[in-house]
């Protein structure tokens, strides 16, 4: 699986999940989110080639059209498989609130 | 919705489904696929930014930092929503069989 | 919150060594890939050199391969960069950054370590 476990100790080229820390101020200038202050959201990037993880029957197709006509630019994406939430404080006015907000870090990629 | 009856119409330049025929035998080698002799598969391209289609949360949030950090590298990529399969024709020995391949066409995109 | 404070910079002469740290927290460190990254004078952040979660693979930038090592102490939460045979143009404040800085251009979060090469 293309996983963190995976990705982060292999440093694979082709796709994977990357790490991405985020800081809500800095990053996207959340200022309303009073804890955590940032997250590993992670990314997934890196070439899809023929057979890479296909996530259907059409990203396999594609993969080997991709690879037999290279110059076609068609090929399939690095994206997000599994992602959990992540629970967040935030402040109502003086009220504290928490909420957690699905799919916010993703643990696994596919080529889709 | 970034499906084939938009896309096809209005040649977006952001993510949406393409139009791309594939034949069997040209472009994959598959001389076992007797009918049809090729299908429209499409594939989906294009630019992810901030809001567009946003699958989840992390691709909004990852649209948000792409935009706000542009030199970063990580943003949302278009990839197929949904699709539809593909009924076709084989021969075994001289027995033809008729079999529904799942998943083969894309019909809409997304941005992950 | 994440923080990541760099040490050992210095004025060295050229062929000299030096050994940069920085010491992680907030994260879990040993789950991460780290990398180090570097900004010379007037320059945009140049990747140097990334290491793997459990510090088994790592790669640099052709610039510094064969001069440099990175390691790691998971341990310690601390990443190391031994940088041998330097040369001028390794002239440059060094930072540290979380992630695989191959693929993402890291805000810097540290204060970085100057490092000057000159005789």
């Known amino acids: 699986a293309l996983d963190t476990n995976y990705c982060f100790r292999n440093l694979e080229e082709n796709c994977c999940v990357r790490p991405l820390y985020i800081d809500f101020r800095q990053d996207l200038g959340w200022k309303w989110v009073h804890e955590p202050k940032g997250y590993y959201a992670n990314f997934c990037s890196g070439p899809c080639p023929y057979l890479r993880s296909a996530d259907t029957t059409h990203s396999t197709v594609l993969g080997l059209y991709n690879t037999l006509n290279p110059e076609a630019s068609a090929s399939p994406c690095c994206v997000p498989q599994d992602l959990e939430p992540l629970t967040i404080l935030y402040y109502v006015g003086r009220t504290p609130k928490v909420e957690q907000l699905s799919n916010m870090v993703v643990k696994s990629c596919k080529c889709s | 919705a970034l499906d084939t009856n938009y896309c096809f119409r209005n040649l977006e330049e952001n993510c949406c489904v393409r139009p791309l025929y594939i034949d069997f035998r040209q472009d994959l080698g598959w001389k076992w696929v007797h009918e049809p002799k090729g299908y429209y598969a499409n594939f989906c391209s294009g630019p992810c930014p901030y809001l567009r289609s946003a699958d989840t949360t992390h691709s909004t949030v990852l649209g948000l930092y792409n935009t706000l950090n542009p030199e970063a590298s990580a943003s949302p990529c278009c990839v197929p929503q949904d699709l539809e399969p593909l009924t076709i024709l084989y021969y075994v020995g001289r027995t033809p069989k008729v079999e529904q391949l799942s998943n083969m066409v894309v019909k809409s995109c997304k941005c992950s | 919150q994440l923080q990541l404070v760099e040490s050992g910079g210095g004025l060295v002469q050229p062929g000299g060594s030096l050994t940069l740290s920085c010491l992680a927290s907030?994260?879990?460190?040993?789950?991460?890939?780290m990398s180090w990254v570097r900004q010379a004078p007037g320059k945009g952040l140049e990747w140097v050199s990334v290491?793997?979660?459990?510090?088994?693979?790592?790669h640099y930038s052709d610039s510094v391969k064969g001069r440099f090592a990175i390691s790691r102490d998971n341990a310690k939460n601390t990443l190391y960069l031994q940088m041998n045979s330097l040369k001028p143009e390794d002239t440059a404040v060094y930072y540290c950054?979380?992630?695989?800085?191959?693929?993402?251009?890291?805000?810097?979060r540290g204060q970085g370590t100057q490092v000057t090469v000159s005789s």
């Open positions: 290491i793997g979660s459990d510090g088994a693979i790592k």
């Open positions: 907030g994260f879990t460190f040993s789950h991460y890939p």
């Open positions: 950054a979380e992630g695989d800085s191959r693929y993402v251009r890291n805000r810097a």
